[in-house]
């Protein structure tokens, strides 16, 4: 990090050391060096000497002017050329920052992932501010009117144990930095309505070589929620568009879903669930690959990290979700 300079003078910025990106700014340097009437004053930005837009104001002070300053961060310092000194003399340095006031936070979303013990609140922060921006999440009980505030720089996890004011709350987010402050709309939540069931996972697949070959996908979740609605999407890996099947599910046993697929094609499957009738879905599960056989029955399990081809038996991995560009959480 930046170490302090023993200053032999003063450096300052107008309008301020943190300012709106695109502004015209002036940096002033005033020398106070014993036995030195500076012959010349130099400005450096990020360790590189500036050549232009420097004006000498008086014997000890100079001004560096920037038009339309667009740098998110710069370290400035200035030096003096003193008579009879072989080297320049350091005067002082300062960090400067430019950025934007925060946008109004929108798309405020709060969910409780089953078994997590937390309510997770997220929001769209808007455009990059470039400067340190803090967020205060306000949670107000509609029953007790008690309000709690949580400071963060991104999302927030709030322990459900700390939500003692009943089931209904108002949640809103305040964004603030050196250049401004904005507040989101209020989100009304009921704790029972925002629970997302424990993750559904595809464990294996098999293709049964009947008259019409049939692929069975085995999948499960550890959820204790009784009424769960799920979607399974699948497509050939060469395709862009997904096919979607919907299920009303009871997870007291492993689910088996049947698909009639084209032979000798590699397919990818994903599943997600929600509490029936509620608003929020799980993120899509990890990608699960299965190649249908030409004739031989095949089983796919998550035992290996890569496809193995061995005497007609295909064993393929579950690849992690970041392999797909369309693997967003779809919360909301």
């Amino acid at each position: 990090g930046i170490t302090n300079i023993n200053c032999s003078g003063h450096i300052w910025v107008e309008p301020a050391t943190i300012f709106k990106m695109g502004m015209n700014i002036s940096i002033y340097c005033q020398a106070a060096i014993k036995n030195c009437q500076p012959r010349k004053l130099h400005f450096y930005k990020n360790g590189i000497k500036e050549r232009f837009q420097i004006t000498r104001i008086n014997k000890t002070t100079a001004r560096l002017w920037y038009k339309n300053f667009l740098e998110p961060h710069a370290s400035m310092y200035c030096t003096a050329e003193c008579p009879k000194h072989f080297q320049e003399t350091l005067i002082c340095g300062k960090d400067i920052s430019s950025g934007y006031p925060p946008d109004i936070p929108d798309e405020v979303t709060c969910v409780i992932y089953e078994y997590s013990g937390n309510m997770t609140c997220t929001w769209n922060a808007g455009k990059l501010t470039y400067i340190d921006t803090k967020y205060v999440v306000h949670v107000k009980s509609l029953e007790t009117e008690e309000e709690q505030q949580y400071l963060t720089s991104s999302y927030i996890n709030i322990s459900t144990d700390s939500l003692q004011g009943g089931k209904k709350y108002l949640v809103w987010v305040q964004a603030a930095n050196a250049l401004g402050m904005e507040e989101s709309k209020q989100l009304q939540i009921h704790l029972d309505d925002i629970v997302i069931p424990s993750a559904a996972v595809i464990s294996r697949a098999e293709t049964i070589n009947a008259t019409v070959p049939k692929t069975i996908i085995y999948w499960d979740s550890q959820t204790t929620i009784e009424k769960v609605s799920c979607e399974m999407r699948y497509k050939a890996t060469t395709n862009q568009t997904w096919n979607v099947k919907e299920f009303d599910t009871n997870f007291t046993y492993v689910q088996q879903s049947e698909f009639y697929l084209e032979p000798n094609i590699k397919y990818v499957f994903q599943v997600r669930c929600q509490e029936t009738g509620k608003r929020y879905w799980q993120p899509w599960s990890s990608l699960f690959f299965h190649k249908t056989p030409e004739t031989v029955p095949q089983v796919t399990s998550k035992a290996f990290q890569h496809d193995t081809w061995n005497s007609g038996l295909t064993v393929a991995s579950i690849s992690t979700g970041h392999l797909t560009s369309d693997n967003r959480g779809d919360i909301g």
Epitope: I5, T89, S98
Partner: antibody, heavy 122, light 111 residues
């Protein structure tokens, strides 16, 4: 963990063009000035481009001036080097490097990527 | 441009002994009492790693057996005691002014 990953290297003919990329992670990219440094097959290191945090200031040595252009996309945390009118002497491993100030006045290349190779040959 | 001349081009040192690498700048790399001289280590297949900045300050995580000294135009990097892991190329670099320039490197090997 600070990570710089270069890509885009390859083989081109003299006079050709190529664009290198450097994906940054593990630090606030927009707060750092960045550079490209190349290493010739003879292992000589040569600084080839500098860019300030917002891209307003760029500097190059005479050997590449007018042929190379450094740029950055702070929203994507990515640094670029557009190279044109390539010559055989541009053949090198190209590294992107972060510049860090240990004081206001003293900047060093504190983190380097693993590099990407450019070969210019007919 | 400031030209950096490194010597020797290669060096073989026994385990536990001292390795000294020199670097001379074509003009002073000092200003306002600071020497703008840095040292890097590079192992095969790896990028350079910062060892020493401002002539004598150790980079983060750099073992104490690496030390730098000098001012003006003459600088040196000392490694003592020499360890097997220190086999590498070493480069000096001036950061006083653009264009920033490097020495041609010194190959350090075990004797």
């Amino acid at each position: 963990e600070v990570k710089l990953v270069e890509s885009g290297g390859g083989s081109v003919k003299p006079g050709g063009s190529l664009k290198l990329s450097c994906a940054a992670s593990g630090f606030t990219f927009s707060r750092y000035t960045m550079s490209w440094v190349r290493q010739t097959p003879e292992k000589r290191l040569e600084w080839v481009a500098y860019i300030s945090t917002g891209g307003g200031d760029t500097y190059y040595p005479d050997s590449v001036k007018g042929r190379f252009t450094i740029s950055r996309d702070n929203a994507r945390n990515t640094l670029y080097l557009q190279m044109s009118s390539l010559r055989s002497e541009d053949t090198a491993m190209y590294y992107c490097a972060r510049r860090t100030s240990y004081s206001y006045y003293n900047y060093v290349f504190d983190y380097w990527g693993q590099g990407t190779t450019l070969t210019v040959s007919s | 441009d400031i030209v950096m001349t490194q010597s020797p081009a290669s060096l073989a040192v026994s385990l536990g002994q001292r390795a000294t690498i020199s670097c001379r700048a074509s003009e002073s790399v000092d200003n306002y009492g600071i020497s703008f001289m840095n040292w890097f280590q590079q192992k095969p297949g790896q990028p350079p790693k910062l060892l020493i900045y401002a002539a004598s300050n150790q980079g983060s995580g750099v073992p104490a057996r690496f030390s730098g000294s000098g001012s003006g135009t003459d600088f040196s990097l000392n490694i003592h005691p020499m360890e097997e892991d220190d086999t590498a190329m070493y480069f000096c670099q001036q950061s006083k002014e653009v264009p920033w320039t490097f020495g041609a490197g010194t190959k350090l090997e075990l004797k």
